[in-house]
């Protein structure tokens, strides 16, 4: 999906009002310096591409983020404020239902959510030059 036509300001507002708090809640008890940010993005569409990937695509050691409140809010934000987003996703994932597993917060998930926090912060500051 091409995120170029999203309403970035509405997504930013959703992040600032709710998603950011849910990410902080998830990371509670973790030092902010514990993980190095290794994933970056260069502009808002690119940031949303990376956020989508990190939030919804299962990775080795962390398969459970879709059940988290920040993930559901991200999913709905993209569906509402990115024209055509939900249409592309309905067909792509209709046959991928999996049996629910017990929710476990692993260190790998904490690292992944730390990366997400960095991507969201970058999304909110699109005019900053890449470090």
């Amino acid at each position: 999906y091409d995120f170029t036509n999203c309403d970035f300001e509405k997504i930013k507002a959703a992040y600032l009002s709710t998603i950011s708090k849910d990410l902080i809640t998830y990371m509670s008890g973790t030092k902010s310096t514990e993980f190095n940010n290794t994933v970056s993005c260069s502009n808002r569409p690119h940031c949303l591409t990376e956020i989508q990937s990190l939030t919804f695509n299962p990775t080795a050691g962390c398969a459970s983020l879709a059940k988290e409140m920040f993930a559901m809010k991200t999913k709905a934000a993209l569906a509402i404020w990115c024209p055509g987003y939900s249409e592309t996703q309905i067909n792509a994932t209709q046959a991928m239902k999996k049996r629910r597993k017990r929710k476990v917060t692993t260190n790998k998930c904490l690292e992944q959510v730390s990366q997400l926090q960095g991507l969201w912060r970058r999304f909110n500051r699109p005019l900053l030059k890449q470090q």
């Epitope: 919804f56 879709a66 059940k67 993930a71 999913k75 996703q89 999996k98």
Partner: nanobody
């Protein structure tokens, strides 16, 4: 799997009101989002509103200030109060519920849809 049944659609005059209901049955989980999509003839399906288990809500610009989403957790039901309806609100309205059990970006459960027609 959660089953969703919508009701409340119908024919209404411009400026009128309707309240859609979406009753969920089946498994229930702590974190969830319930929302409403709509699809007008010949147009893409669009999400117009969402409500989360923590009470926060989202609205599309096209309905903000006119539509109100709410949920009654004791009844496992979500509502969409639609006021100041316009002809362009005419569409099939679909309820969705999600608790993160799908691997990917779509929503777990979809209702069959209820038709809303705004016409004089």
């Amino acid at each position: 799997e959660v089953q969703l049944v919508e009701s409340g659609g119908g024919l209404v005059q411009p400026g009128g009101s309707l309240r859609l209901s979406c009753a969920a049955s089946g498994n229930s989980f702590n974190n969830y989002v319930m929302g409403w999509f709509r699809q007008a003839p010949g147009k893409e399906r669009e999400m117009v509103s969402a409500i989360f288990s923590d009470g926060s809500t989202y609205y599309a610009d096209s309905v903000k200030g006119r539509f109100t989403i709410s949920a009654d957790n004791s009844k496992n039901t979500a509502y969409l109060q639609m006021n100041s309806l316009k002809p362009e609100d005419t569409a099939v309205y679909y309820c969705v519920r999600d608790s993160g059990s799908v691997s990917g970006q779509t929503f777990d459960s979809w209702g069959q849809g209820t038709l809303v027609t705004v016409s004089s």
